[in-house]
């Protein structure tokens, strides 16, 4: 027998649907109406036929009471080819819901998103996460999506983006955005970061995550942040192959005094990089290739320094490698 596509936990909290049949029974998803966190995986299906079954231009207010009764607070939609018009229709309807967090993953968005009608209400999300989402509209996708959201977005995460750079002139400011995560875009690089950090569009950023984004030096990142006017309190550069030395011809970069936490773990560093901020509350240099203890003059003034998992701390080990097991408090790097 075929397993049920949707499973609701016994507390009406989590509901997961995996639609893998070529002709899925979408009505099975109705058992998720009482769930708080809902995940719908569409098995790579093309949702184009849906457009024939729904009126994407219908006034969503007619569904307002039905949608308000949904308990869903967090929704994940994955693995499908979605016409932009259908996505917009869904966003318009969900604007009447209690939805706070939306995750889109492994989606191919086809066609262009229509402009927001004057009478339409934007979706009041606090968090939007995108992973491996491709858009037919190229660089203007963020601006097109943004118009369907209210301006209170606090967390934006964009991973495995096909176009991590945005059409900055079309993007409006994100006044409430405190966390921006561009991790897992290995092709981004420092130039791409400059293009992605649209100047003065992210005025409230406190946390910036750039794990595995092809960054090369902390100084290069500093320059990109300075150019964009972005002053995070916390910066995560872990899982990048960082160079410790700075190009002598590159201008010196002054880090923002707002920065108090810097993560440089898993960065392949053989020495403490030059050009770090003068003062930090937290500096994580764990799981690098430091063969000797850093000298005080190599380090910023720092309250909380993590050096676990470096060769100089582990007697008799060579460079740390994936899956190595270390004793005591030393993490497996």
């Amino acid at each position: 027998t075929t397993p049920e596509p949707c499973e609701l936990d016994d507390e009406d909290f989590r509901c997961v649907c995996n639609f893998s049949e070529p002709q899925p029974d979408w009505s099975e998803a109705f058992q998720c109406v009482s769930a708080v966190e809902v995940e719908i995986h569409a098995g790579g299906l093309n949702l184009e036929p849906f457009l024939k079954r729904v009126d994407a231009d219908a006034d969503p207010r007619q569904y307002a009471d039905t949608v308000k009764a949904l308990r869903v607070r967090r929704l994940t939609v994955g693995a499908a080819q979605v016409p932009a018009q259908l996505l917009v229709g869904a966003l318009r309807v969900l604007a009447y819901s209690r939805l706070k967090e939306l995750t889109l993953e492994d989606l191919k968005i086809t066609g262009t998103m229509p402009p927001l009608p004057l009478e339409a209400t934007g979706l009041a999300l606090s968090s939007l996460r995108l992973r491996n989402v491709s858009w037919a509209t190229g660089r203007s996708w963020l601006a097109e999506l943004q118009q369907w959201l209210k301006p209170g977005l606090k967390v934006l995460s964009i991973a495995q983006a096909h176009s991590p750079a945005f059409s900055c002139e079309q993007v409006r400011a994100f006044p409430a955005l405190t966390s921006l995560d561009l991790s897992d875009n290995p092709g981004l690089g420092e130039r791409g970061l400059m293009a992605a950090l649209c100047p003065h569009k992210f005025p409230a950023i406190q946390n910036l995550a750039l794990r595995n984004t092809g960054m090369e030096t902390p100084t290069g990142v500093c320059a990109a942040l300075a150019a964009a006017g972005v002053q995070p309190h916390s910066l995560d550069l872990s899982h990048n192959s960082l160079r410790a030395t700075v190009n002598p011809s590159a201008p010196r970069c002054m880090w923002s005094s707002a920065l108090n936490s810097l993560n440089l773990s898993f960065a392949g560093l053989e020495q403490v990089p030059k050009g770090l901020p003068a003062k930090l509350r937290v500096l994580d240099l764990s799981c690098n290739r430091l063969n000797r203890a850093p000298q005080p003059d190599e380090l910023p003034e720092v309250d909380n320094l993590t050096l676990d998992g470096n060769p100089f701390l582990v007697p008799g080990t060579a460079l740390p490698h994936e899956g190595s097991m270390n004793s005591g408090v030393v993490p497996a790097c």
């Epitope: 936990d9 507390e11 009406d12 989590r14 009482s34 966190e37 009764a69 308990r71 968090s127």
Partner: antibody, heavy 115, light 111 residues
Amino acid sequence: QVQLQESGPGLVKPSQTLSLTCTVSGYSITSDSAWNWIRQPPGKGLEWIGYISYSGSTSYNPSLKSRVTISRDTSKNQFSLKLSSVTAADTAVYYCVRGLRFAYWGQGTLVTVSS
Amino acid sequence: DIQLTQSPSSLSASVGDRVTITCRASESVDSYVNSFLHWYQQKPGKAPKLLIYRASNLQSGVPSRFSGSGSRTDFTLTISSLQPEDVATYYCQQSNEDPYTFGQGTKLEIK
């Protein structure tokens, strides 16, 4: 059978940060459900503080939101509460609880805010 | 926020009596076919214990003399035949919408 156990200091000074940890046994906090903090001032009723879900998503009571952080350590199967800028009004028994119909409770820990 | 108002605030009844506690919500706590209203019993110095979930479902291990009913905004907890061990404070709670809220409690004593 899921079991929850609160731990942390029983006395916190005014204006400081209250920190509590809940250790969960018999169930993984990443498999499903919401993992809540609820408090009860002496002789008073119950107040929901907030939760962290299996996915890491958080939801807080708006009356406390500016002072509350709930986080988790999945490697230890623990979740934690931090409540900043405490006053005497934050003196209460603090419970960690699983789910949104609160079927599984820790035994509670009394935190007194006093200088 | 959804306010829950319990009545009475306290009551005294004799062993064997049928006892009813009501809980009124400031707005509906229903989501489609379910009412997200639950009932708890708390004895002094102990954590609350879930008695009834989703308005009318008896939690495993709870004696069958406890029952719940109601929908939308009006709910009732009934003890069909009061026992000495039922002396406690009873709370209703809604989980339809955050912030999740409790009633102020009903203190039940034996005459």
